[in-house]
Each structure stands twice: as C-alpha cells, then as structure tokens.
C-alpha cells in the first residue's frame, strides 16, 4: 500500500467514573465519545495539511469506568482529587502501543480553567504525540506519551458540546505537532481590526474559545505547517488505511448490526460480542429485534420501545425525544421557538440549539466588556451587548443604555464562560480568571520528567 492511504489514526478512549456519573449510562457515554470523535474527524478530514488530506479517526477500543469502578484498585483513574498533570500521567503509565493516540475523558474541574492536556508531537527526536511507543523514562517508569486528556467541566459548569469538541481537536492538535498559535497571522481574534477579530481565533489558540466563531473549528496556517511536518515523518509508523468498521469498539458503524464491545464488556443479551467468530460478531442474535448498543429506544429484552417512551430529556431549546416504536434510534426532538431564553437567560435558542446570545433577542450582538476598553473589571463577567459592528456601544446588560430591554437587571455569564476577549474564564464568584496557558507545563518542570521532555507537553 502507498503511504498516502495510511490516513487513519486509531484511538483508545477511556472514560473515568466521574464522566460516567455525569452522563448516567454506558449508552450515553458511548454517544459522547462518538460525537467527539465525529467532530474531530470532520475537522481533520476537511483540512489540507500541505498536501496530506483526508486524515481521519477511528475508535479502536473503549473502556468505560462506571461508578462501580470507583473503588477498583486496577482502575488508575479512581482517585477523586488529582491535578491535571497527574491525571495525564496516569493515562501515560499504561501501555498504548496498539494505538495512534489514547485519551481519557473526565468530568473534573481542573485548576485555572484547564480543559485538557496532551503531549506535543515533533517531526524528530521527540518524546510524545502520535504513534509514540512506550519506553522507559528517567523517573524509572515506562510511559506511553501518545496520550491526552480532556474534561467537560470548567469552574463548576459543564462546557457546551461545541467547546468540548474543539478542546478535543486542540489536544489532538498538540499530539499532531502543533504548539499554541502565536503572532498576528494566527491569532486574528486578538486583532484591533474588527473585520479580522469577528471571525475569532483558531483551534490552537492558547486561551479561551466560545466555539461559535468562524475560525474556532479551523486550524491556522501556523498549525498546518507544524502538523504537516509531523504527519510527513510519523504517520507511516502507526496510521492505518481507512475502511473496515471495528467490531468491539462499542459503536455501531457501517457494516455492523450492533456492537456491545468485547466479551468482558458486553452486558447485552441481544448482540454477539466481538470475541465471537467472524460471521457472528457484531450481529444481532437470532430472533432479536434490536440491541441497546444501537440506541436508547431498544429495551434490554431486545425489543423496540413503545411509541410513547421518552428517550431524551427536554432541554432549554428542544422538547423531549420520544421513541417511535420502529427504530432503536431516538428521533430528533422538536425545537423550541427561536429566541427562547436558555443557559440561564444568557443565550437564546436558534434552531433547537442554545447558540445565540441573549443580545440577539433585541437586535444587538454580544461583546466583551474587556478591560482594555477601560471597562470596570467587575463587568468582565457580565453579558454585554453592542449595536451590530459598533464596539463603541458595548455595555453591560445592567447598564442604563440597555435598560429598555433588560430593565437594569445585570445578566452575568455562566461560570466557565470566556471573558475579557477570550483571555480567561469566569469563575463562580464572577471574576474573570486569566488562563495561564503554560501553567501545567511549568509545574511539570519541577516534577518527575527529565529536561528534554519539558517542551513536549501542552494544554
């Protein structure tokens, strides 16, 4: 085969008991993994890395640590209070030679607004990133540095899916060899030019993202240059040809009827597990209508749930999902009317998603009450609105200027929301806490790794 066909990075995704606790069921956790992988797959597939195209991702294996594994001594992620560097290290202490990358998803509130951490790839002489094999390091431990971690929690709030997807793409971007974006060309969101600024920053921006600006889910030219060099050198080491579905990864892919994982994971009476012979694995057992692995509208008794059963909770912007009686998938929910308030009155619904700012309800657009504009620091975590394309009219929702719409009531950003022009995140006390993009790196310098590794870890 030609190297051009080796374009798929196979992933091992683990989730800890806190991630499971938040999402509640194995099926919901698998749906989260699937949506994250699909999101980065779309981003990377549509990026031309200096002639290297169609880079894709496939889940090779998953491990879901449930709340039952919280006390299991073989579960390295069982500890309740671990910092982000230690959490990444626990992942790296496992052997991940069978995978391009190995990630752990968690629901932990790490210090200083950190949403993820990963080892940075380099074209040569590197320890870390894609395809890196397990080896002995100076602290006397074997480690796999083809690793990263992400969390879905920030300052006590859960980040929106689009932000979490970009976090995953960002951390994987480090693994692929990209450092943080810097310089005017690659950080347009910091520009004084309004036309450039409004498109926002790229995936590898060092600080905060809202996920809804044009550039937020694209790689900058700086990232593309770095990633293409690493892909050129490294992808032949572990990337595979895309194609066949992977039976046993818990995700029902094209060509599979169901997928309940391997025999040690499969709790499903409906589906043949991945350890079965070729003709049977990932197929429905005889006489079974469906498998819960196909979706939430299938019972544990392998039958479609009845028409009236709920399969998705009502949310701010969408009505509850109701099974239709003839598929295991949960049908799309009806959207609530556009401009319905959501996310505690800080945003509005657009086409069933909590996507717009509350400002849009009144023909305004959201702006940052940024200290560089001479605004009071106390306003950095207020929702602020301005007239379209007119930053000179940026004012807090609590200001007299917008009192006709908000009646003088200050609407504050949710904890974990970007603030001060994406330099930081709001904490629970409504203070804008600047993101120290290289904090964990600095702490690791004092930890167990030898000096040659210092440059190769990043948020």
């Amino acid at each position: 085969t030609t190297s051009a066909e080796k374009n798929t990075c196979q992933l091992y995704i683990q989730t800890d008991h806190l991630f499971f606790k938040y999402y509640g069921t194995r099926e919901a956790v698998i749906a989260q993994i699937s949506s994250h992988v699909k999101a980065i797959d779309t981003i990377y597939q549509t990026t031309d890395f200096s002639g290297i195209r169609n880079i894709s991702f496939m889940v090779k294996r998953i491990r879901i640590n449930t709340t039952a594994d919280e006390k299991d001594p073989t579960n390295p992620f069982r500890f309740p209070n671990i910092g982000v560097e230690k959490f990444l290290e626990l992942n790296s202490e496992q052997n991940h030679d069978d995978y391009c990358l190995a990630y752990v998803f968690t629901d932990r509130d790490f210090d200083d607004g950190v949403l993820g951490l990963a080892w940075v790839g380099a074209p040569s002489g590197s320890s870390g990133g894609i395809c890196e094999k397990s080896k002995l390091y100076s602290d006397g431990k074997k480690k796999s540095l083809n690793t990263g971690i992400i969390t879905v929690q920030n300052y006590g709030s859960h980040v929106p899916p689009k932000v979490s997807h970009i976090t995953f793409a960002h951390e994987v971007g480090h693994n692929f060899g990209s450092p943080h974006d810097s310089g005017t060309e690659c950080t347009p969101g910091e520009s004084k030019n309004l036309g450039q600024k409004e498109n926002g920053n790229y995936i590898m921006y060092a600080r905060a993202t809202s996920g809804d600006k044009l550039n937020n889910n694209k790689f900058s030219l700086c990232s593309i240059r770095n990633i293409s060099q690493v892909l050129e050198k490294k992808r032949n080491n572990c990337f595979v040809e895309s194609g066949q579905p992977i039976c046993g990864n818990g995700m029902v892919e094209q060509g599979e009827e169901c997928d309940c994982g391997y025999s040690d994971q499969c709790k499903d009476e409906c589906c043949f597990d991945a350890n079965q012979p070729e003709g049977r694995k990932c197929k429905l057992k005889p006489g079974k209508q469906c498998s819960p692995s196909q979706g939430p509208c299938c019972t544990a008794q392998c039958a479609f749930k009845s028409k009236s059963e709920k399969c998705r909770d009502d949310s701010d912007c969408a009505r509850e999902g109701i099974c239709n009686g003839f598929t295991a998938l949960c049908p799309a929910s009806d959207p609530k009317p556009n401009f319905t308030d959501c996310n505690r009155h800080t945003q509005v619904c657009i086409n069933g998603q909590c996507a717009g700012s509350i400002c849009e309800k009144y023909g305004l657009e959201e702006c940052t009450c940024a200290s560089s504009d001479g605004k009071d620091d106390k306003e950095l975590c207020h929702v602020c609105c301005m007239k379209k394309m007119d930053p000179s009219t940026c004012a807090s929702t609590g200001s007299v200027q917008w009192s006709r719409h908000f009646s003088g009531r200050t609407i504050t950003l949710q904890p974990g929301s970007p603030c001060n022009d994406f330099r930081g995140y709001c904490d629970v006390f409504m203070r804008c806490r600047l993101v120290d993009a290289d904090g964990p790196l600095a702490r690791l310098k004092k930890a167990i790794f030898s000096p040659e590794l210092y440059e190769n870890i990043a948020e």
Partner: nanobody
Framework: EVQLVESGGGLVQAGGSLRLSCAAS????????IGWFRQAPGKEREGVSC????????YYADSVKGRFTISSDNAKNTVYLQMNSLKPEDTAVYYC????????????????WGQGTQVTVSS
C-alpha cells in the same frame, strides 16, 4: 427617513426658563428612545436627559436634576425639554437624538440626530 427638528432655543437671563421641542417623523415614535444632548464651545457633547417613549421612563444627568423635565406627546410625535432655573453654564447648542435600541446619556448609542438649537443664558 428619520427626521428630528429642534426648536425653542434662544437668549434668556439666568434663573429664567425655556421649553425646547423635538419634532420627530419617519419612524414609529413609540419604538424609540429620545435623548437631549448639549455641546458648549470647546467641550464634548454631553447627555442631558432621555425618555423611553413607549413607557415614559426618564433619566437625567446629575447637573440638571430638579431643574429640567423631559416629556413626550405621542399624538404629536414630539418630545419636550422644560428647562427652569437656567444657569450661564447651561449655555450650549442643544440637540435631540433618537434610537430604537438604546437609552441613556451616552451619545455613542444614538443613531439619529437633529441639527440643534442654540440656548444662551446670560448673567
């Protein structure tokens, strides 16, 4: 097309009164806030008072509170500024401005402006 025409300015002795009018046309009067602003020679334009036409809520600069009163006649699409106990420091060109979204005394927030009327207070 939005049009604002001020009238009622003139020369008055300190302690006297004037009533300024702002006649509006070309827009749905009820949807807007109307503000009065003034600019003295060599100084920045400053907000004096404003009114939200739909609900009648008003706002005043500290320097004119208790002396100036803003009101509107929705049938005539006109906003008035009654100025009592005038002082020499009230001397300026007085402008009215209108905006569909904003309110308050920051001139940056107002999209539509009249030509202004001169008020001179002699001591």
């Amino acid at each position: 097309e939005v049009q604002l025409v001020e009238s009622g300015g003139g020369l008055v002795q300190a302690g006297g009164s004037l009533r300024l009018s702002c006649a509006a046309s070309g827009f749905t009067f009820d949807d807007y806030a109307i503000g009065w602003f003034r600019q003295a020679p060599g100084k920045e334009r400053e907000g004096v008072s404003c009114i939200s036409v739909s609900d009648g809520s008003t706002y005043y600069a500290d320097s004119v509170k208790g002396r100036f009163t803003i009101s509107s006649d929705n049938a005539k699409n006109t906003v008035y500024l009654q100025m009592n106990s005038l002082k020499p420091e009230d001397t300026a060109v007085y402008y009215c401005a209108a905006d569909r979204l904003a309110y308050g005394l920051d001139p940056n927030f107002y999209d539509h402006w009249g030509q202004g009327t001169q008020v001179t207070v002699s001591s």
